[in-house]
Interface confidence: medium
């Protein structure tokens, strides 16, 4: 064997560590943890790069990583690992996390480009819940890969501190 397993290290990656179980589920196997952005392929018997299979139809093994990768490719979006969702910065500007700072600050400089609700927000019509550090604290959270909105998803300040710390 050559060229395999050299980068393997202890500790579980944030990327889902999944392996086949006889029941057909993909379950975590701590003893076979792989570096971040890799997964354990039981048939190949080694850690594999998730990037290699993100374009493949069936990437159950790397679903989280691939969603994150695809999300990062889209301007004005970021992947939230706690929510496991692709978040649209446009929907949360004014109460945005640091991941949206570049997008939102550029948008806010040109109010003509803003959607009406954000123009209202900018002129103080909507309560601004961000503190001085710019952390998103308490309004409705919108945006996902499949659709631009996740209506009704409300997060507490504690949850959001977790997400964006």
């Amino acid at each position: 064997m050559s060229g395999l397993g050299r980068s393997r290290r202890g500790g579980r990656s944030r990327v889902d560590q999944e392996e086949r179980s006889p029941q057909g589920l993909w379950t975590g196997v701590a003893m076979r943890s792989c570096p971040e952005e890799q997964y354990w392929d039981p048939l190949l018997g080694t850690c594999m790069s998730c990037k290699a299979i993100c374009n493949h139809q069936s990437q159950r093994t790397c679903a989280t990583f691939c969603r994150s990768l695809n999300c990062r490719k889209e301007q004005g979006r970021f992947y939230d690992h706690l929510l496991r969702d692709c978040i649209s910065c446009a929907s949360i500007c004014g109460q945005h996390p640091k991941q949206c700072a570049y997008f939102c600050e550029n948008k806010l400089r040109s109010p003509v480009n803003l959607p009406p609700e954000l123009r209202r927000q900018r002129s103080g019509e909507v309560e601004n819940n961000s503190d001085n550090s710019g952390r998103y604290q308490g309004s409705e959270h919108r945006g996902s890969e499949a659709s631009p909105a996740l209506p009704g998803l409300k997060l507490s300040a504690d949850q959001l501190a977790l997400v964006y710390s």
């Epitope: 392929d41 048939l43 990037k51």
Partner: antibody, heavy 118, light 107 residues
Framework: QVQLVQSGAEVKKPGASVKVSCKAS????????MHWVRQAPGQRLEWMGY????????KYSQKFQGRVTITRDTSASTAYMELSSLRSEDTAVYYC???????????WGQGTTVTVSS | DIQMTQSPSSLSASVGDRVTITCRAS??????LNWYQQKPGKAVKLLMR???RLHSGVPSRFSGSGSGTDFTLTISSLQPEDFATYYC?????????FGGGTKLEIK
């Protein structure tokens, strides 16, 4: 469409080496693992080894360890399997097969017959 | 390594017949069982992955069932082009292993 085209039949003497090629087309070569499988006359299909798509990492069956070398040329979208120290029992049809990431091999080459005879 | 045992090793049937081939794994492999078709001088073809999922372009007369250690491939109505050798393969764990094959011949 996906195609794997292998090199032609070979006749070799015992102790010699053989190198079989597998040219891929119809997909992004570096996105899939390429495996090699052989079938001796009257025998079952036998897995030999594979090469990873994004680096030159390889893994071989214990049975062939030390005698088999799988390589690739990304620019030519071609994988190679070299088997050394040939013996008569290596007479077989050698196949390259693309791994579909789900535990199966979704496309195969047409096979290359290697005959080892003195 | 997981051992795969196919039966029967050969089978004679006629066009229009319903045919069943079985494959047994030496240990539980869930549903990670694939079937292939091989004709002389032709490339091996994937028929079915994950026990019962037809590969693209495979006719619906082919079906698969089973789980754990016992699996079957069924051809509901044999066509002339179905006379070939069929292999099962476990995709559950390294290294991949194949059954001994079932040769389907014209009666």
């Amino acid at each position: 469409q996906v195609q794997l085209v292998q090199s032609g039949a070979e006749v070799k003497k015992p102790g010699a080496s053989v190198k079989v090629s597998c040219k891929a087309s119809g997909y992004t070569f570096t996105n899939y693992v390429m495996h090699w499988v052989r079938q001796a006359p009257g025998q079952r299909l036998e897995w030999m080894g594979y090469i990873l798509p994004y680096n030159d990492g390889t893994k071989y069956s214990q049975k062939f360890q030390g005698r088999v070398t799988i390589t690739r040329d990304t620019s030519a979208s071609t994988a190679y399997m070299e088997l050394s120290s040939l013996r008569s029992e290596d007479t077989a049809v050698y196949y390259c097969a693309r791994y579909d990431w789900e535990g199966s091999f979704d496309y195969w080459g047409q096979g290359t017959t290697v005959t080892v005879s003195s | 390594d997981i051992q795969m045992t196919q039966s029967p090793s050969s089978l004679s049937a006629s066009v229009g017949d319903r045919v069943t081939i079985t494959c047994r794994a030496s240990q539980d492999i869930g549903n990670y069982l694939n079937w292939y078709q091989q004709k002389p001088g032709k490339a091996v073809k994937l028929l079915m992955r994950y026990t019962s999922r037809l590969h693209s372009g495979v006719p619906s007369r082919f079906s698969g069932s089973g789980s754990g250690t016992d699996f079957t491939l069924t051809i509901s109505s044999l066509q002339p082009e179905d006379f070939a050798t069929y292999y099962c393969q476990q995709g559950f764990t390294f290294p991949p292993t194949f059954g001994g094959g079932t040769k389907l011949e014209i009666k």
